[in-house]
């Protein structure tokens, strides 16, 4: 499956779009710093096979989603920007999606790669539950919106490398 | 087949520590959070505490944090409750139970141990 | 804490009946409802998650519903199997939280 070029241009503009969603510094921030656990050996591809990868983009595409198009996103977060950001996942999805479809098919792709698939929702989960605990304050949204940044980018190295191996 | 097997029954006295276990087996262990249940004979059901095995990042319930603790041993997929000291007031079953995670965040206890019996008395 | 409060607290019921029994959160918890069934003397065992979605293996005749702060469990037809405790549960806050057990015994 190729992903199309557009794809790559709509992780570059999703990254740009979580930059400008930036309100405060990150200095002031430093003391909510979290280590969420980011489930690196996801993203290393020695182990894996394509349609698991896409697999597990999928999943963290989908729960980045998840995350900004909460009513306590909205409130925190530049709305127009919002907007664009949601648009240009929606289509990394549906890429990914006709993707999955065509690497391993309808029936299999959810169970196969069920491990790396619940590393992604765990690390989401404590996301979420850190904003919880926050309550959802405007540094705890600069520090899981700086954590994004840094997963989305681990995630676009990911899919430049399985481009290479093409 | 995705298997909890828990120790066998404990008796103890007040002030006593103990240690029980819950060994996982049939998954991948690191890919989902177990935790403990209480049941007190007779009574419901009340939620303690988890842990995520892969980094044994834990949450506790605040009613239950302080007095015990849970642990992992990643190379024997085995889960652990222990207690410093315990009282009359923690004769229980107690359950290990396995959580699993929809793609909307919620958790859920899919599948669980047989129970370890712990009577406490003096 | 989230409270969950089922009714009622026990029910009686013949071979074939329908049931239903309720739970209520003490606030809303989205569909972050779950249901569990304990025979006499074994663990409890997942009937229903998120609400309304049957765990594998677990009969139709148990459905569930609702969201926010109401949900039901209603089996029909029951089976002399089906004659245990009932426990909802929220996974939405923590604690995550039980509700206080309905016992359906036979009429």
């Known amino acids: 499956c190729d992903l199309p070029q557009t794809h790559s241009l709509g992780n570059r503009r999703a990254l740009i779009l979580l930059a400008q969603m930036r309100r405060i510094s990150p200095f002031s921030c430093l003391k909510d710093r979290h280590d969420f656990e980011f489930p690196q050996e996801e993203f290393d591809d020695k182990q894996f096979q394509k349609a698991q990868a896409i697999s597990v983009l999928h999943e963290m595409i989908q729960q980045t989603f998840n995350l900004f198009s909460t009513k306590d996103s909205s409130a925190a977060l530049d709305e127009t920007l919002l907007d664009e950001f949601y648009i240009e996942l929606d289509q990394q999805l549906n890429d990914l999606e006709s993707c999955v479809m065509q690497e391993v098919g309808v029936i299999e792709s959810p169970l196969m790669y069920e491990d790396s698939i619940l590393a992604v929702r765990k690390y989401f989960q404590r996301i979420t539950l850190y904003l919880t605990e926050k309550k959802y304050s405007s540094c705890a949204w600069e520090v899981v919106r700086a954590e994004i940044m840094r997963s989305f980018s681990l995630s676009i190295n990911l899919q430049k490398r399985l481009k290479s191996k093409e | 087949e995705v298997q909890l097997v828990q120790a066998g029954a404990e008796v103890k006295a007040p002030g006593e520590s103990l240690r029980i276990s819950c060994k996982v087996s049939g998954y991948t262990f690191t890919s989902y959070w177990i935790s403990w249940v209480r049941q007190i004979p007779g009574k419901g059901l009340e939620w303690m505490v988890k842990?995520?095995?892969?980094?044994?990042?834990?949450i506790y319930n605040p009613s239950f944090q302080g007095h015990v603790s849970i642990s992992v041993d990643k190379s024997i997929t085995t889960v652990y409750l222990q207690w410093s000291s315990l009282q009359a007031s923690d004769t229980a079953i107690y359950y290990c139970?396995?959580?699993?995670?929809?793609?909307?965040?919620?958790?859920?206890?899919?599948?669980w141990g047989q129970g370890t019996l712990v009577a406490v008395s003096s | 804490d989230i409270q969950m409060t089922q009714s009622p607290s026990s029910l009686s019921a013949s071979v074939g009946d329908s049931v239903t029994i309720t739970c209520r959160a003490s606030?809303?918890?989205?569909?972050?409802f779950h249901w569990y069934r304990q025979k006499p003397g074994k663990a409890p065992e997942l009937l229903i998650y998120?609400?309304?979605n049957l765990q594998t293996g677990v009969p139709s005749r148990f459905t569930g519903s609702g969201s926010g702060t109401e949900c039901t469990l209603t089996i029909t037809s029951l089976q002399p199997d089906d004659f245990a405790t009932y426990y909802c549960q929220q996974t939405h806050g923590y604690p995550f939280t039980f509700g206080q057990g309905t016992k359906l015994d036979v009429r």
């Open positions: 606030q809303s918890v989205s569909n972050y």
């Open positions: 842990i995520d095995p892969r980094d044994s990042y834990t």
């Open positions: 998120s609400a309304s």
């Open positions: 139970v396995r959580h699993y995670l929809t793609q909307s965040l919620v958790d859920y206890f899919d599948h």
